[in-house]
Structure formats: C-alpha cells, structure tokens
Interface confidence: low
C-alpha cells in the first residue's frame, strides 16, 4: 500500500539502485517514485554530513522484502517511494531553494528581475531542466540578476553547493505549465534522427511516448513496430534528443512510428502509467511471482498491488489453467520495461498501474460567514484541491470554497448551505484559477447529496462541516486532485507552514476576487483564541489562525475553503474556513472547523454502498 511517513535521523542500509543530488528529501522521494526499481530512499541534507561529495545525496534503494535496516544518522531523512499513492504521484516540483546553487550544463544565461521569472524561462525552454538565479545582493556585481538555464544527463544536478544570494529550482514543465505547447501527432512510417538517450522495449508507440514524456532527456522518439524488418529491433522504442530540441531530420521508413514528448503540453500531461492490456502478447522479464487468478484484469490488479511488480503476463495455455483460474506471471526488469515482447501467444500482458494517479486509494486521509485579506495571487495547480461552490439562480455567482477529498467528495462548511439546501441550484467548479474563465461551456460537477453534520445549527459556529457527494466522479490532473486529510484526533503535530486560499473578499466591504488568493497564516492556540472571542465558545473541534496585528485573513466568500498545512513535505487539510469577527481585524483570528476532530464522521459518511471506505488515514 501507500506509505507516506518520513523517518528523520535515519538512513536505510544497503539496497542501492541509484544515487544523485537533490535539493531536499521531497525531490529525492519523487525521483524514487519514478524510478522503476526504487522502493525506499535516504537523503543527506547539507547539515547532516561533512563530506562535501555526499551533501545533498539522494540514495535510491530496492528491497525484496520492501524494507531495509535503518541506521541512525543525525540529519538524514529516509522514506518510501510513493508508488501506489494515487493522486500524490506527481513529477511536478515547485519549490525554490534559497542559498543553493544546483550545478549542471549551463546552456543559456539572461538577466531577469526575479527568481519567478527565471523559473518561467526555464519552464518555457524545451531543454531546461533546472536553473539558478543570482539575486541583486550576489557578491559579484556582474552576475547579479543572472538566470542560468541548465540540464544534465540524468535531469538532476551534477552537484549542489551552498552559495549565498543564489536561488535554484526546477522547470515546471512536469506541472503542465509550459507555454511551449506540444505536438500530439504520431507520425506513421517515419523515423527521426539525432541522439539516442535510451532504448526500451514497448508494445506500442503510445507506451513509448509516455516513457519519453517522463524521461528527463527525451524530447522525441522513434518506435519500431513488431513487423519491422530487423527482428532484433522489433518493439524497440528509441528515446531521442537534439541540440535544437527538434529532430534535425526524418526519414520515411516502413513500420516505424515517431512522435514527441508531451512534457511541454499545457494543462494536461499523460498519466505516468500504461493501463492498456495487450491480448496475444507475452512480456518477458525477471520472475517476481506466479499466482493463479481469474481473468487478466485481476492479474493486472495483483501486479499493481505487489509494489515491485512492473508488468505481467496472464497465460491462457491449458497447462497454465485449472478450473476458472490461470497463471498470472508477475515480472520486473532493470528499466521497468519488458526484456522481451512476443506476439501470437496465448497470453495477455500489461503493466502495473502503481504509478496511475487514479487508484482506489484516491484520498489519503493521512458568526459572520467568513471570508482572503492580505493575500496574493495563486498560480495554476498550486492548490489543486480548491473548488468553487456556485449557485445558479437568476445569475450565477461564487458563494463558498471547498476542498476535493476524493474522486466524488468535497468537504466544505455547513453554513454555506444556510437557506440553500437544494442540491440542484449548486454548481461545483474544480481545476480553476480565475473565476472569469468560467463560461457557460466550462464543465462543472453537480451535487448528488449534501451531508450536513447532524449537530450543526444555523447561526451557530459549532460543527460547521458538510460533505458533498458529486453526481459523477472526477478524474485527477495536476490542477484537480484531492488534499490529504489528517489522522483522527491529530493533536501532536505542530504545524508551522499553513495557508488559507479562496476567492473571497480582499477587504471587509469588498468583492469576490477573480484570481484564487493565498495567504500564509500562523495557527493560534485555542486558549489565545478564546481570549479574543469572549462572547463565543472556542471548542477543541475548532482551530484558529491569524496574526496578532491582523492584516491577513480569510474573508467573505472563502467560507468552506481549506486551511492547509505542509508537514514532512505533504499538505494536509487542517481546517475548514468557518467564521470570524470581520476580516483581518487586529487580535481577531479566523476560526476554522478542525478536520482531525471529524475524521470518524467523514469516514462514516463516505463509506461506499459496499461498506468499503473511500479513504484511509495515513499510516
């Protein structure tokens, strides 16, 4: 299953399959997730080791048992791959690293005014993988405001050095934010020239294209079909690159198919997995296990659940079957692709779905209506769980926020439905940033059921929580995916990085904002909060957040939206925007429904009809 916990001051011994430099443990974990053999990782921050060569070291590890012995190492961080973790699987990494220079091949330098502009340039350059930016206070004047675009053979820095007044980060192409655009065309009977960066076996050109998209240096590919004239080259997928970023030449060639990486697509990237099943095809590889199952789909499910399994073959040979069950061969290889592909067999083959975003584990549950003041504009995909709850009456207008917590579930505030309990007047917009982008053609979700907490009373602040079941499940994308829920009764975690988001008023007597706003707000103890609201009871099922001096807060229209906190690299839904005295007033924190206190209720209400929970708490 999905294991998200990180182990601090611990290092996994043995099992190494690869090593690289990464700026933090989260990026190391992402590289582990996308490595075909990696199940575990260990990361050495700069502060944890004196050996300059091992600083920022990211060590990817495999284990037949799924675990390795941990040794104590001060400062080290270890953890698990996020394979099987559904919506948490993403190659997108937005963080900017201050005081760090990520080294690589510098192929472009320009003067820019901010690190954000440098990151944008990298994202809009086809070859750029990461970048470094020298700030205005950099010690050498001639380098100030320099934006260095970089690449490396593996897509990760060749070294990482601590350097004052330098900021580094990665291209946001994996976040589907590139302005370049992409070529969806597949060119039949055409072979591309240029440099081969890798060679794998795939059953078709579409799998070849997805592998190219997630390979750090693949810009285009050529696939040789199973009827290609040279037998040893059949089903070969050649991943390619060039200096210019496009093929320098192409040759008409029977039984070849060529195309481009889809990494530069805007707004949608293909999932990093291959769900198609190939009848009459055998995939060869190292045997992991053989089990008897009923049907090829069950075989694929079995492979997906066995975390080390990469691909499978389901045999229908009479000697491989007994009664209704046949042998399911679970296999793996060094590069995650079959070592042999045979056609005209009595088998059916396919791949593990462990890297798909849309598994069943879709949710890790790891007095005046309020309202964001003092915030800034959000960017695409920054808060992909944020939804806009809108009412369609004479006109249509944003009314409340909400948080996507599953394919078919949204969590919001109960008071959003005061006087509006009819589900057919509501429209729920997900995967949006600008409200002005909504037109009559914008897809929206309709409500199947509104579940208001049984103890909620109109005009009271208590139990201000409601679940919305959508009429149809949503697919997950970089811009639309759920937020993890906290563990039941989560009281021990100290959250220091918390944000509130919404389209609400930017001042008490303001108006709804067009661009989703975000504001970083510290949590306030309930004791402190109670002092500020002596006329109200601040219960343990509430959480407060705000600055003593005011100036930053949720406001009207933010109600029901998320208060999220980042802990150990993972965002969790800590609160639901509920109420407050005015907006951003001095010594008047915002009051939020404490989600951890309602985990039993959420899990009970989201039970599916067959009794299986739609979400589970983090381990």
């Amino acid at each position: 299953g999905c294991l998200t916990q990180l182990y601090e001051n611990a290092f996994f011994r043995g099992g190494d399959v690869a090593s690289m430099y990464t700026p933090n443990a989260q990026y190391c974990q992402m590289r582990c997730t996308f490595h075909p053999r990696c199940l575990l990782f260990s990361f050495l921050p700069a502060s944890s080791i004196n050996d300059m060569e091992k600083r920022f070291g990211c060590f990817l590890k495999d284990s037949v048992t799924g675990t390795l012995p941990k040794v104590h190492r001060t400062g080290a961080v270890s953890g698990h791959s996020l394979k099987q973790c559904g919506h948490q699987i993403s190659a997108c990494h937005r963080d900017i690293y201050k005081g760090v220079d990520m080294r690589g091949v510098n192929f472009n330098v320009s003067k820019v005014s901010s690190v954000e502009e440098c990151q944008k340039r990298c994202t809009s350059n086809i070859r750029c993988q990461f970048f470094s930016y020298a700030t205005q206070t950099f010690h050498k004047a001639e380098y100030r405001n320099n934006c260095l675009l970089k690449y490396s053979p593996g897509g990760t820095p060749t070294a990482i050095k601590v350097l004052s007044n330098v900021e580094s980060g990665f291209s946001l192409k994996p976040c589907a934010l590139s302005e370049i655009g992409c070529h969806m065309n597949i060119f039949q009977h055409l072979a591309f020239s240029d440099v081969d960066v890798a060679r794998v076996l795939t059953p078709d050109a579409f799998v070849c294209r997805t592998i190219c998209t997630y390979h750090p240096n693949c810009l285009f590919f050529t696939f040789y079909t199973n009827v290609w004239k040279i037998e040893s080259q059949r089903n070969v997928c050649l991943l390619k690159t060039s200096e210019s970023g496009t093929p320098s030449s192409s040759t008409p060639q029977e039984n070849t198919i060529s195309g481009y990486s889809l990494l530069t697509c805007k707004r949608t990237l293909p999932e990093p997995c291959h769900s198609k099943i190939y009848p009459g095809v055998d995939f060869g590889g190292e045997e992991l296990n053989v089990t008897f199952v009923k049907g090829v789909n069950v075989c694929q499910e079995t492979c997906t659940k066995m975390i080390r399994c990469q691909f499978f073959t389901y045999s229908l040979l009479p000697e491989d079957c007994k009664e209704e069950k046949c042998k399911c061969f679970l296999r793996l290889s060094m590069d995650g692709s079959p070592t042999r592909i045979a056609y005209g067999t009595q088998g059916s083959s396919g791949y593990s779905l462990r890297l798909c975003n849309t598994g069943d584990n879709s949710v890790c549950t790891t007095k005046t209506s309020t309202r964001i003041v003092g915030g800034t504009n959000s960017s695409w995909g920054e808060w992909p769980w944020q939804v806009s709850l809108q009412v369609k009456l004479t006109a249509q207008r944003h009314l409340c926020g909400g948080s996507l917590i599953g394919h078919q579930w949204v969590l919001t505030a109960a008071h959003c439905f005061d006087g509006l309990p009819l589900q057919d007047v509501w429209r729920i917009y997900s995967g949006i940033l600008n409200l002005s982008d909504i037109t009559k053609d914008t897809p929206f979700s309709q409500i199947k059921e509104i579940i208001i907490h049984q103890n909620y009373k109109v005009s009271e602040g208590n139990h201000d929580i409601a679940l919305i079941k959508l009429q149809a499940p949503l697919n997950y994308t970089e811009f639309q995916k759920p937020i993890c829920l906290p563990s039941k009764g989560d009281t021990s975690t100290i959250y220091t990085n918390c944000w509130v988001t919404g389209w609400g008023f930017s001042k008490e007597k303001g108006e709804i904002q067009n661009i989703l706003q975000k504001v970083n707000i510290p949590l306030v103890t309930n004791e402190e909060c109670q002092k500020r609201y002596q006329d109200y009871k601040i219960t343990q099922r509430m959480v407060c957040a705000g600055y003593k001096e005011g100036g930053k807060d949720a406001c009207k229209g933010d109600s029901g939206g998320p208060l999220v906190c980042k802990h150990n690299g993972m965002w969790r839904l800590v609160g639901i925007t509920s109420w407050g005295e005015g907006c951003a007033r001095r010594e008047q924190p915002g009051v939020y429904t404490k989600v951890a206190e309602y985990m039993d209720w959420i899990l009970e209400k989201t039970q599916s009809s067959d009794g299986k929970a739609q979400m589970q708490s983090p381990a």
Epitope: L393, Q396, L399, T439
Partner: antibody
C-alpha cells in the same frame, strides 16, 4: 462609488426600435451579471432580461422574448438592450441593475432609469 | 413562474407607528426574498436581502423575517422619509418576480 447610468430612451412608434445603454462604473463590471427591470407608469416592477458576466448566458421574460436582445461590452463597461417590434405595452421606465452585493442578495444598485414611450 | 402576493396593497400610518407588510410566494422559495423601497420618480432601493439581512446603509428600524412561502417586512417606528412603495422580490428561480407593491401613506 458603484454607479449605473441608463441612456437611449425616448418616443418611438409601435413596431419601431430603440437601443438602451447602461454605463457602469465603480466595480468590476465583467464579473457581475446584469439585469434590465422596467416599470410601466403607475404600475409595479417587472423583470425584463438578465445577462451573465461573460455575456454567454442570457434570459428573457416571456413578454419580450424574440423582440428584445440583451448584450454587454465588458471592455466598455456597458450593458445594452436592443428593443425591436415595440408595442404600446412596452412603455415604461427601464432600469438597469445588478446583484453587486451579497450572493443571491437582490438587485442593487439601480440606475436612475430611462423612459421609453411607445405611441403613434 | 413563481407568483408573489403582497398585502395590503396600501396602508395609512402615522410617524412612530409599527408597520408590517407581508409577502406570500406561490411555492417555497427558501430564504430567497428581497425587499425594496421606491419613492416617486426614483429608482428602487434594496432594503433587505435573503429574507432577513439588512442591506448596508439601511436604518435598523427595517427588519425582515420568514422563510419558505411567508415573509414579513417590519418598520419598527415609521419615520417621515419612510412613506413610499415597498416591493418584495424572489430570487429563488428564473424569472425573478416582484410583488405588486404596498404603498405606505401618511394617515
């Protein structure tokens, strides 16, 4: 200050046409739905037509459907009502209004109105 | 369409009186009921929205109540500037519809 200012009213013969305009200021016009409401002399208020923020969604009262067209130019912060095939019963003061306040909170503010008289 | 019926259609009252106007919807409109005041030759002015919420800048002597089909506008102590015509309006469904109005005159 949020303001709406209608213009374009006047005397017109039955069967004739008229185009009313409503200039908006003091708020983000492109975000709000806009509405025309009319009031015949000595009578009550009657909703005429509404248009969505982007102009894509329009709705009309049965009494004007097929004859009146509501539109907006967000770049000019202006709302329009094109009135064709006018009848005597269309004689009224025409107000433009929006729902600038709280969600579902009724029509506010209103313009001062422009008088349309349909008479031969 | 939802019909809105106001009563009375007119009433006479004195300064300082408590005045109540009722509005009935032909079907349930939840709390989607708004009240307007209109003086001769002027545009309507929103007083109460969502049945009971006082519009910014409106004196607190005006109040609204009700939900479903029956609603009330109350002026707790009538002032000289309150003599006008009052309309209710539902914003629950399209088309929005108004009541026929209640004229409040000086006794």
């Amino acid at each position: 200050e949020v303001q709406l200012l209608e213009s374009g009213g006047g005397l017109v013969q039955p069967g004739g046409s008229l185009r009313l305009s409503c200039a908006a200021s003091g708020f983000t016009f492109s975000w709000y739905p806009m509405t025309w409401v009319r009031q015949a002399p000595g009578k009550g208020l009657e909703w005429v037509s509404s248009i969505g923020p982007s102009g894509g969604q329009t709705i009309y009262a049965d009494s004007v459907k097929g004859r009146f067209t509501i539109s907006r130019d967000n770049s000019k912060n202006t709302l329009y009502l094109q009135m064709n095939s006018l009848r005597a019963e269309d004689t009224a003061v025409y107000y433009c209004t929006t729902e600038y306040g709280d969600y579902g909170g009724g029509f506010d503010p209103w313009g001062q109105g422009t008088l349309v008289t349909v008479s031969s | 369409d939802i019909q809105m019926t106001q009563s009375p259609s007119s009433l006479s009252a004195s300064v300082g009186d408590r005045v109540t106007i009722t509005c009935r919807a032909s079907q349930s409109i939840s709390s989607y009921l708004n009240w307007y005041q209109q003086k001769p030759g002027k545009a309507p002015k929103l007083l109460i929205y969502a049945a009971s919420s006082l519009q910014s800048g409106v004196p607190s002597r005006f109040s609204g109540s009700g939900s479903g089909t029956d609603f009330t506008l109350t002026i707790s102590s009538l002032q000289p500037e309150d003599f006008a015509t009052y309309y209710c309006q539902q914003s629950y469904s399209t088309p929005p519809t108004f009541g026929q109005g209640t004229k409040v005159e000086i006794k």
